[in-house]
Interface confidence: low
Amino acid sequence: KELKVTQPEKSVSVAAGDSTVLNCTLTSLLPVGPIRWYRGVGPSRLLIYSFAGEYVPRIRNVSDTTKRNNMDFSIRISNVTPADAGIYYCVKFQKGSSEPDTEIQSGGGTEVYVLAKPSPPEVSGPADRGIPDQKVNFTCKSHGFSPRNITLKWFKDGQELHPLETTVNPSGKNVSYNISSTVRVVLNSMDVNSKVICEVAHITLDRSPLRGIANLSNFIRVSPTVKVTQQSPTSMNQVNLTCRAERFYPEDLQLIWLENGNVSRNDTPKNLTKNTDGTYNYTSLFLVNSSAHREDVVFTCQVKHDQQPAITRNHTVLGFAHSSDQGSMQTFPDNNATHNWN
């Protein structure tokens, strides 16, 4: 019977750590000579197994090749690693009397794809916080996967984003691969509760993609709106001033009251009000004894947020000497509001 070496599977896929069988059958045992398994072709091919009875870690013959009529030269590779990926050839040699064995026929080859899971995606963002309307880049990285085909998607609050660039390295064949993707996000003031998600889908993940998450709260700064107002007097001798810092993030806030430019009170906020969008509000009350002030006084509320330059709002209250009518109070509609003591 004419010799034919058959490798029925063009390819097999195996998860890292599992076993795989590479099948090889012959139609004839003649001419006499060994069968060997190689990975790769050409001068640099690697001898994997030769059925010569020697111990090869992780590789066993499937059938008993010592039997005279055995024509099954399949092998089992156990505990497969990404380094085992490649094309395996079952090769028949003719035994030489004095010269080396001569290769007479090879099977068509079986490609082993080692399925290695990608690492959990890591999403990194800018080192410094951005502000609303600023465009910031996020990068997602995952490594160690095989085969090379992989899908990476970006989402912001459930909406898919289009990446600036996605690259899978190396570009040639390799035992495992890495993916890196960059997306650009336009921050807005409602993003404190938002998340940017990098989702990686791969054949090894059984329809359960891996996700890397970046909470935009770690990458955004929303500066407060600061307003100073005067409440209606509670008695003849006192004025209530209120400084309100609204919709800021993160929490880090320092508030100082100044009287004619001199520090009057340091206010370290403790009980912040949290808004539904994740930002905070803070209200500072400043009770001023009017009997101590006959001249105009400029009160300043100075707010320092997250190590940023201070935001100041002035509020002028007219001295007692200006007031002809004990019940009067003038208001000037701007940030430097002016009121009578009363």
Epitope: T151, L152, Q159, H162, E165, T167, I179
Partner: antibody, heavy 119, light 107 residues
Framework: QVQLQESGPGLVKPSQTLSLTCTVS??????????WSWIRQHPGKGLEWIGA???????YYNPSLKSRVTISVDTSKNQFSLKLSSVTAADTAVYYC???????????WGQGTTVTVSS | DIQMTQSPSSLSASVGDRVTITCQAS??????LNWYQQKPGKAPKLLIY???NLATGVPSRFSGSGSGTDFTFTISSLQPEDIATYYC?????????FGGGTKVEIK
């Protein structure tokens, strides 16, 4: 100057798979920085984006077609291809391939190839 | 998906007229918008990218503006060769979507 040329059968029977190839000339598909897209246009209608591939592997599909579409790239032949399975008469359209830079738009298009789905 | 609403769907203008086409996105897409021209039987041609940048070799009578959800495409002085259908396209969110098109004719 990059040029694109679509090729493939102009007539496909219902339930079969539509296969088109876009050949890139005047530049390398694997030079990076570009997406290679497929777009179609039903007779007398607007444009519909089918999907895009980046030379190094990542592929993006229109969800409305995702279950039937496969886009692949063959860097050795400087080609990318589209396969659309289980076609019906509703897939009759002019199919275009295009090159797109993220911040330079779809600046190169093939001339388009008409595919009719009919028995 | 992001919906791109283009208006008008068709218009007729005289040579030399100023022609304006608007495109509205169903949500904020920043400036991630392109404009294309398509003549009968031909492939689309890129005119404007990133909302306002003129593509290479495109005459300066074409311009684009806008950001967020509202965008405008203008032909400052209509020429006979400008008879075509014009499309906007967003690329902020997948899947990329096109407007329904505006057919421009000469009176």
């Amino acid at each position: 100057q990059v040029q694109l040329q679509e090729s493939g059968p102009g007539l496909v029977k219902p339930s079969q798979t539509l296969s088109l190839t876009c050949t890139v000339s005047g530049g390398s598909i694997s030079s990076g920085g570009y997406y290679w897209s497929w777009i179609r246009q039903h007779p007398g209608k607007g444009l519909e984006w089918i999907g895009a591939i980046y030379y190094s592997g990542p592929i993006y599909y229109n969800p409305s077609l995702k279950s039937r579409v496969t886009i692949s790239v063959d860097t050795s032949k400087n080609q990318f291809s589209l396969k659309l399975s289980s076609v019906t008469a509703a897939d009759t359209a002019v199919y275009y391939c295009s090159k797109e830079g993220y911040h330079s738009g779809m600046d190169v298009w093939g001339q388009g190839t008409t595919v009719t789905v009919s028995s | 998906d992001i919906q791109m609403t283009q208006s008008p769907s068709s218009l007729s203008a005289s040579v030399g007229d100023r022609v304006t086409i608007t495109c509205q996105a169903s949500q904020d897409i920043s400036n991630y918008l392109n404009w294309y021209q398509q003549k009968p039987g031909k492939a689309p041609k890129l005119l404007i990218y990133d909302a306002s940048n003129l593509a290479t070799g495109v005459p300066s009578r074409f311009s684009g503006s806008g950001s967020g959800t509202d965008f405008t495409f203008t032909i400052s002085s209509l020429q006979p060769e400008d008879i075509a259908t014009y499309y906007c396209q967003q690329f902020a969110y997948l899947p990329w979507t096109f407007g329904g098109g505006t057919k421009v004719e000469i009176k």
